[in-house]
């Protein structure tokens, strides 16, 4: 829903987005996820902080912890048991990375209103979860993991080899949360909590990156992680499981690696639970093209667990890596054994299958020119998943539900025609056995989050409509966005372009392309959003254009893998290709073009100014990586392969930004980087500044003490403040 | 507050049965794998025999294999062992326990006697 | 079965001794090792869990060391409410042992 465009006589009461709306975040919207506690109840937080109970059926609701409770441990957050006995109230929560933190947690015991004193959880806790079934409680502690039968009883210490940046129980290094897992945990509890799996990562031959973090004392500390750059020595990862009844029986028991992915270096890339006494894991080679799926049983005679052979399946791509971002996971359905994945089909294009016995024989469920991107959920008789196949827009997200229950099995897009201009880009939150469900909508219109009833798809009620950000940009002149696409030497290049309030095709106007442009990322897509670019276009006047070229994802593998062994090629090469058609279009100033970029941007950004062309003004680089040795191991081989002479090193080599430094001669180029960057180091930036003095080439610089690869706090608002002085400059705009 | 409180002990001729009972308040019982420990007058404490919190899963001492029989209800919270074939040997306090993570014994009853004599 | 030895049988002590008592597996019981405390004609009560673990309640001056085989009961300050046969216990395997008992004695 965009506020309509209005006539002259009122335009005058119309203002323009200020860079100051955008670093408040006057106009952010809201989403409502239900925290659903069985097929017809979930929690939610009110304003007032209380946490509240709905009964769909009922109609009724109540809270079930009040906001003087939470306020008493200054709780951020909460969790209820799933007997309904208990609430773990989450306080001190310190961040640590992109998904882990530590916290302080209290347990409130609901039947007698208190908090359970004795045997109280030690602190700083690492992750903290409720067994599926019942009050047991999994934490970690000081990197080892401990059960506890009921939270009054003291606890039961699983591990005891866990160390600091050596030995990691139940959760995650550096490197499996941020490139694999993309969790803060590594334990999974059995569907009835009978057993709990759990991850061993020993990082104690891994290099270490190690950085000044400056803080207010007289001398920096040293910040050390355990961080594999590409080549160099990996996690070593093993997968245990413990019965949580018998804890001390037989203790954990590992869980064995398939011989095809043991016999040389691996990866553990997912764990699922299919019954109390089935689990499946999934394992991937170092090189990153062979993925194989085990489902493994427990043996009650041994009280082991057997993965046998015949229950391995292997996914291989020969084109590129395997899966998407990271390789799918399996949904399985009701008999326990066969399953739901999507991978590539023939056509190379992401699809629903239906495994049975062997991938090979796997039934295909989705097909076509599109790509199904999440199966939320499988029910007795349908499968709900996530695609972008409505009107071959790859850029949206629409759910369909198919009936599995029937033959042949039929097809219904959910959400396609329910607000059609204000909702093209859905995800949804299913209740037990999709009973009901909730829809998120992000756009293009103002976000909304409906209920429905998950047997008619009926909307049930509108939790979350963002009235008063409806409200709010009544009076705003937004700039208008179009989503199109060019279609050069075979390949489709979607583009989303931002322009200007009063835009006017006859006139001449700076344009400012924005790039991500990693793998199996997209850029171009149908959702909301009120930000920095839509600022510079309503009140600067700029053209803002996103282009998604090689290596994006949903539209098929010959696209995804196109940039397969050769990053930093054809991403900027189709950057600079969508210019060039940009310019053809006759609205863009061909003096005032820019390009800026974060993080993979940035590394394209730099690429594109150095490229030679002649048709980047200038351009920004914020956190870029400069060469492909100094990125994590998991991620970067992914993609590029090794280092090494046999493999790939030419390439690694041939793709930095420093070997460019010359070619930045004839562009203004600002480069901007946290210290503590423990994502993307410091170190690219600093080489990059290293190769451009010593060509003797000019260039502006900004770093940002102590801050890591987001930038946040007050760094924000200097780091878009400072930004926008430079393009104003760069495109002779008056401040 | 947790609270064992056995009973069902007394004097019974060898070859004789018993079955002692315990009583479970204060914690929720069908949690919890709960066990049968004794001491013999003047002597140490040996375990007997314990029992899964869903009364599936049993374990006995080599002593009393094949002539006890542990069980449990859990809608009654209340623990059971039966004893068969009972010898002058098994002559002891008998205590219920509660047997946490099959690893410690957190609480204990207060003990009921069982004599066997002729 | 896993054999629990404690030593010493019995020892006599003074009110503000310090007092240790070991207990020794006949194989390896990692950290599953357990002490407790009985007086005459009570049932034992948890004092040590897991080895070096304080039973909730149970006053500081009780400790507990050791892993594997070799297992220590520490009281660091004896009172007169602690004069009582200690058991030590192992809890591996579903298969629980005791130790003979140490009494302590008033000197």
């Known amino acids: 829903l965009r506020p309509s465009r209005v006539h002259n006589s009122e335009e005058n009461t119309m203002r323009a987005l200020t860079l100051k709306d955008i670093l408040n975040g006057t106009f952010s919207y809201k989403t409502f996820f239900p925290n659903w506690i069985s097929g017809q109840e979930y929690l939610h937080q009110s304003a007032d902080n209380n946490i509240v109970l709905y009964n769909i059926e009922t109609g009724q609701s109540y809270t079930i912890l009040s906001n003087r409770t939470m306020k008493s441990v200054n709780a951020s957050n909460y969790g209820l048991s799933p007997d309904r006995q208990f609430v773990y109230l989450e306080s001190d929560y310190s961040k640590l990375w992109r998904y882990s933190y530590t916290a302080t947690y209290y347990i409130y015991d609901l039947s007698n209103g208190e908090f359970v004193r004795g045997n109280e959880l030690p602190r700083p806790i690492q992750y903290l979860c409720w067994s599926p079934v019942g009050s047991k409680l999994a934490y970690v502690y000081q990197n080892n993991i401990y059960l506890k039968q009921r939270p009054g009883d003291p606890p039961f210490q699983i591990t005891f080899n866990g160390r600091e940046n050596k030995i990691f129980n139940g959760i995650p290094d550096w490197v499996y949360e941020e490139e694999m897992l993309a969790t803060k945990y590594a334990l999974w509890w059995s569907p009835n909590g009978k057993f709990l799996a759990y991850a061993e990562f020993n990082d104690t031959d891994i290099p270490v990156i190690a950085y000044s973090y400056y803080g207010d004392e007289q001398y920096p500390r040293t910040i050390n992680i355990p961080y594999p750059k590409a080549g160099a020595k990996n996690p070593v990862v093993r997968i245990f499981i413990i019965d949580t009844t018998y804890p001390a029986y037989v203790g954990p028991q590992e869980v064995p690696v398939p011989a095809m992915i043991a016999s040389s270096d691996y990866y553990f890339s997912w764990l699922t639970w299919v019954t109390d006494e089935r689990v499946c894991l999934q394992w991937l080679k170092r090189v990153q093209n062979v993925s194989v799926l085990s489902i493994c049983d427990f043996r009650e005679d041994w009280q082991t667990w057997d993965c046998p052979k015949t229950q391995e399946h292997i996914e291989e791509s020969r084109t590129g890596w395997a899966g998407g971002f990271f390789v799918s996971t399996p949904v399985f359905s009701y008999d326990a054994i066969s399953y739901y994945k999507i991978f590539s089909d023939k056509d190379g294009y992401k699809h629903i299958h239906y495994i049975k016995d062997t991938v090979e024989n796997a039934i295909q469920i989705t097909s076509g020119k599109w790509e199904a991107i999440n199966i939320f959920r499988v029910t007795q008789d349908s499968l709900f998943y996530s695609s972008n196949e409505f009107e071959e827009y790859p850029g949206r997200r629409n759910i369909y539900r198919i009936s599995i229950g029937s033959y042949p099995p039929s097809k219904k897009c959910v959400t396609c025609h329910l607000r059609k201009e204000r909702c093209q880009y859905y995800t949804a939150s299913f209740s037990d056995y999709a009973k009901y469900y909730a829809l998120v909508c992000y756009g293009p219109g103002i976000p909304i989050s409906t209920l429905h009833d998950g047997r008619t798809d009926q909307e049930i009620k509108i939790l979350e409509e963002n009235k008063e950000l409806e409200n709010a940009l009544k009076n705003i002149q937004l700039p208008k966005e179009e989503i199109k696409k060019l279609e050069v030497d075979e390949i489709t290049l979607w583009y989303k372009m931002i322009l200007p309030p009063q835009f006017d095709r006859s006139k001449k106007y700076p344009l400012l392309i924005q790039v991500y442009g990693g793998p199996c990322s997209q850029s171009v897509r149908s959702v909301f959003a009120v930000n920095w670019i839509s600022y510079l276009a309503s009140k600067e006047g700029m053209v803002i254009a996103l282009v998604d070229g090689r290596g994006t994802a949903f539209q098929g593998d010959k696209l995804l893998y196109a940039v397969y062994r050769k990053l930093g090629v054809y991403e900027v090469e189709d950057q600079i290709t969508a210019v060039r058609k940009f310019i053809e279009m006759g609205f863009i100033d061909e003096k005032r073009i820019a390009i800026w970029g974060w993080s993979y941007g940035g590394y394209v950004s730099s690429l594109a100014l150095a490229s030679g062309t002649g048709l980047f003004k200038c351009g920004i680089a914020v956190a870029p990586v400069s060469s492909w040795e100094y990125y994590a191991s998991v991620y970067t081989e992914r993609f590029m392969g090794l280092p090494t002479k046999d493999d790939n090193l030419e390439h690694y080599k041939n793709s930095t930004v420093m070997a460019r430094a010359e070619y930045f001669r004839n562009v203004d180029y600002l480069l901007i980087h946290g210290t503590a960057d423990d994502n993307v180091h410091f170190q690219n930036s600093a080489q990059i500044a290293k190769a451009l003095v010593n060509a003797q080439v000019d260039f502006q610089a900004m770093w940002y003490s102590d801050q890591n690869h987001g930038l946040s706090g007050l760094s924000t608002n200097h780091l878009y403040t400072h930004m926008t002085h430079f393009l104003k400059q760069c495109f002779s705009l008056s401040d | 507050e947790v609270q064992l409180v056995e009973s069902g002990g007394g004097l019974v001729q060898p070859g004789g049965s018993l079955r002692l009972s315990c009583a479970a308040s204060g914690f929720t019982f069908r949690g919890y794998i709960m066990s049968w420990v004794r001491q013999a007058p003047g002597k140490g404490l040996e375990w007997v025999s314990w029992?899964?919190?869903?009364?599936?899963?049993?374990g006995y001492a080599d002593s009393v294999k094949g002539r006890f029989t542990i069980s449990r209800d859990n809608s009654k919270n209340t623990l059971y062992l039966q004893m068969n074939s009972l010898r002058a040997e098994d002559t002891a306090v008998y205590y219920c326990?509660?047997?946490?993570?099959?690893?410690?014994?957190?609480?204990w009853g207060q003990g009921t006697l069982v004599t066997v004599s002729s | 079965d896993i054999q629990m030895t404690q030593s010493p049988s019995s020892l006599s002590a003074s009110v503000g001794d310090r007092v240790t008592i070991t207990c020794r597996a006949s194989?390896?019981?990692?950290?599953?090792l357990n002490w407790y405390q009985q007086k005459p004609g009570k049932a034992p009560k948890l004092l040590i869990y897991a080895a070096s673990s304080l039973q909730s309640g149970v006053p500081s001056r009780f400790s507990g060391s050791g892993s594997g085989t070799d297992f220590t009961l520490t009281i660091s300050s004896l009172q007169p409410e602690d004069f009582a046969t200690y058991y030590c216990?192992?809890?591996?395997?579903?298969?629980?042992?005791f130790g003979q008992g140490t009494k302590v004695e008033i000197k």
């Open positions: 216990q192992q809890g591996t395997l579903l298969l629980p042992t």
């Open positions: 326990a509660r047997l946490l993570y099959g690893t410690w014994f957190d609480y």
């Open positions: 194989q390896s019981i990692s950290s599953y």
């Open positions: 029992i899964g919190p869903e009364g599936s899963r049993t």
